[in-house]
């Protein structure tokens, strides 16, 4: 089959209460079949590209864990498995703060180097 | 050929702790994850956790982060599952799995024989 | 976390004859299912992942399918060594969930 292109598949929007949980759904499609090198999954809050990061977390050669090195305030959990193309985050205790636009990138290292970032993100609305 | 072999059978009293060892052979340990997966007397598999040998790093299912901690040894290629304060919904056979690849899938491909924890006043 | 329910709880079936478990998963998974089978005082034992490919020296009458938050396991001609229970298991979300299991017997 033909190699599937970069793609992110993210809802325009996502909608909460606050002090309630809310889950940023992020799936993708990338050329690379059969990737099993290091890979780095990033959200990141304001602006695609240069918002700052709230989570980060990286899976080693071979690994399905995706060791967490950023969670902002500790309320940021990845619930999809980047192995299985899905970067779905849950944040937790909602704020009136966390009322923005949220944007998923991924990151191959090792023999591929390559990355991609959602445009668009997913608004989350805290009412 | 690969082989996931644990400790023995326990008996523990409510609020102790456990530790479950396995020792992994035939194959390179640090490369692969290992996850710990409970299943009680005639009940479904739970997911526990998961490590990876290579890094230490590991991460858990919700429900038992706060009793559960996973370890390993890569001296001895053996990975540990601790489970504290013990109570009687604990009482499972407790197996350990190793997370195989192949052309970019992952699935459990060997398990070890499993170690029943009795929990019992 | 994501629930996997299998029906039929269990499944009796004619020697030769075909057994179809499904399970059903509470959101999309992709097709990030694997399949397992386990025997009385044994550890499961991996049949199929990602939904359709056979495990290395599983037979072939063991064959699956489904995508999304549909899956079917099938046995296309039962033997009595496939006496078991047969669980799925989804892998796209963590934490792993796994179905409540699917007992097949002999008729």
């Known amino acids: 089959s033909p190699a599937q292109r970069w793609s992110m598949q993210v809802p325009p929007e996502v909608s909460a209460e606050a002090g309630d949980a809310a889950v940023l759904p992020c799936t993708f499609t990338h050329p690379h079949r059969h990737y099993d090198g290091p890979l780095t999954a990033i959200w990141r809050a304001g602006e695609p590209y240069a918002g700052p990061q709230v989570f980060r977390c990286a899976a080693a050669r071979g690994s399905e864990l995706c060791q967490t090195a950023l969670s902002l305030h500790g309320r940021f959990r990845l619930l999809g498995n980047p192995r299985r193309n899905d970067l779905s985050l849950r944040v937790e205790r909602l704020a009136l703060a966390d009322d923005r636009r949220y944007f998923c990138r991924v990151e191959f290292a090792g023999d591929v180097h390559d990355r991609y970032e959602s445009r668009h993100g997913v608004r989350l609305h805290v009412t | 050929q690969v082989q996931l072999v644990q400790s023995g059978a326990e008996v523990k009293k409510p609020g102790a702790s456990v530790k479950v060892s396995c020792k992994a052979s035939?194959?390179?340990?640090?490369?692969?994850?290992v996850s710990w997966i409970r299943q009680a007397p005639g009940q479904g598999l739970e997911w526990i956790g998961v490590?990876?040998?290579?890094?230490?790093?590991?991460g858990y299912n919700e429900k038992f982060k706060a009793r559960a901690t996973i370890t390993v040894d890569t001296s001895t290629s053996t990975a540990y599952m601790e489970l504290s304060s013990l109570r009687s919904e604990d009482t499972a056979v407790y197996y350990c799995?190793?997370?195989?690849?192949?052309?970019?899938?992952?699935?459990?491909?060997?398990w070890g024989q499993g170690t029943l924890v009795t929990v019992s006043s | 976390d994501i629930v996997m329910t299998q029906s039929p709880d269990s499944l009796a079936v004619s020697l030769g004859e075909r057994a179809t478990i499904n399970c059903k998963a509470s959101?999309?998974?992709?097709?990030?299912v694997d399949w397992y089978q386990q025997k009385p005082g044994q550890p499961p034992k991996l049949l199929i992942y990602?939904?359709?490919n056979r495990y290395t020296g599983v037979p072939d009458r063991f064959s699956g399918s489904g995508s999304g938050t549909d899956f079917t396991l099938t046995i296309s001609s039962l033997q009595a060594e496939d006496v078991a229970v047969y669980y799925c298991?989804?892998?796209?979300?963590?934490?792993?969930?796994f179905g409540q299991g699917t007992k097949v017997e002999i008729k």
């Open positions: 990602e939904s359709t």
């Open positions: 959101q999309n998974v992709g097709s990030n």
């Open positions: 298991m989804q892998s796209n979300f963590f934490p792993f969930t």
């Open positions: 490590i990876h040998p290579g890094s230490g790093g590991t």
């Open positions: 799995a190793r997370r195989g690849l192949n052309s970019g899938y992952w699935f459990f491909d060997f």
């Open positions: 035939g194959y390179t340990f640090p490369r692969y994850d």
